[in-house]
């Protein structure tokens, strides 16, 4: 088998402009690859939506805060 | 690829300060914030800092507040990281190394400052 | 702040080992955890970030695991290029710490 994974790079040109509510958040994928043009954040909303974001922005960086610590309480 | 360029090791005297820089390429630093870790001879690592350039903001370990100054030139993509007051502990290799999510994907290749009278 | 422990300081193990290395924080550290592969004179390299995603490029035996403020890395059967040290770092919230690192050496 290989020794390392290759995975398809997903890359965040532009990102969203506005505060997404907490509870319409489902997931979040750090993207740091640097073949990409910028680090950022992609969230998955409940609806099954994608939409990239500014891991600089505050509200950003709390929402990842906040799926963080429910995602620990869920674990038995 | 990304590169982070440091400038060369230094020697300087006890109370001195020391000014270490560190150039990019391949990225724009205003995409990311640029950070600066330290290690002194045979020890581990410490995190010193970080500066947003975008906006300039810093924020630093309250070991270093007041006595450590990062800034920025987004015009040449370089950071800076000043240390003041110099003293025989601060002797170290001096790293920056980028990362928006506070873990360091890309480091320069170190910069030695030594303290000595 | 928060501090990290890594166990042990030092090993030694053969090549073909399997090698485990522990963090424990001093708090829940939600998964924000790194670790790090440094060789004498060189800067660190970033294995792993988020307690468990390899980056891109490192060899899969490398894994990590853990949760709340018990962290492991794992290497499941030791090359020769993995004799180095390895640091963990919190990065739950600043001022982020490291670990105070493991030196694997040859047996």
């Known amino acids: 088998q290989p020794d390392s994974v290759s995975i398809p790079i997903t890359c965040c040109f532009n990102v969203i402009n506005r505060k997404i509510p907490i509870q319409r958040l489902e997931s979040y994928t750090r993207i740091t690859n640097i073949q990409c043009p910028k680090e950022a954040v992609i969230f998955k909303t409940k609806r099954g939506k994608e939409v990239c974001a500014d891991p600089k922005e505050r509200w950003v960086r709390d929402s990842m805060k906040h799926l963080d610590q429910i995602f620990q309480n869920l674990k038995p | 690829q990304v590169q982070l360029v440091q400038s060369g090791a230094e020697v300087k005297k006890p109370g001195s300060s020391v000014k270490v820089s560190c150039k990019a390429s391949?990225?724009?630093?205003?995409?990311?914030?640029m950070h600066w870790v330290r290690q002194a001879p045979g020890q581990g690592l410490e995190w010193i800092g970080r500066i947003d350039p975008a906006n300039g903001n810093t924020k630093f370990d309250p070991k270093f507040q007041g006595r450590a100054t990062i800034t920025a030139d987004t015009s040449t993509s370089t950071a800076y990281m000043e240390l003041s007051s110099l003293r025989s502990e601060d002797t170290a290799v001096y790293y920056c190394a980028r990362g928006v999510f506070g873990f360091f994907d890309y480091w320069g290749q170190g910069t030695t400052v030594t303290v000595s009278s | 702040d928060i501090q990290m422990t890594q166990s042990p300081s030092s090993l030694s193990a053969s090549v073909g080992d399997r090698v485990t290395i522990t963090c424990k924080a001093t708090?829940?550290?939600?998964?924000?955890l790194a670790w790090y592969q440094q060789k004498p004179g060189k800067a660190p390299k970033l294995l792993i970030s988020g307690a468990t995603s390899l980056e891109t490029g490192v060899p899969s035996r490398f894994s990590g695991s853990g949760s709340g403020t018990d962290y492991t890395l794992t290497i499941s059967s030791l090359q020769p290029e993995d004799f180095a040290t390895y640091y963990c770092q919190q990065f739950w919230s600043a001022p982020y710490t490291f670990g105070g690192g493991t030196k694997v050496e040859i047996k």
């Open positions: 708090e829940d550290i939600y998964n924000r």
């Open positions: 391949g990225l724009n630093i205003k995409d990311t914030y």
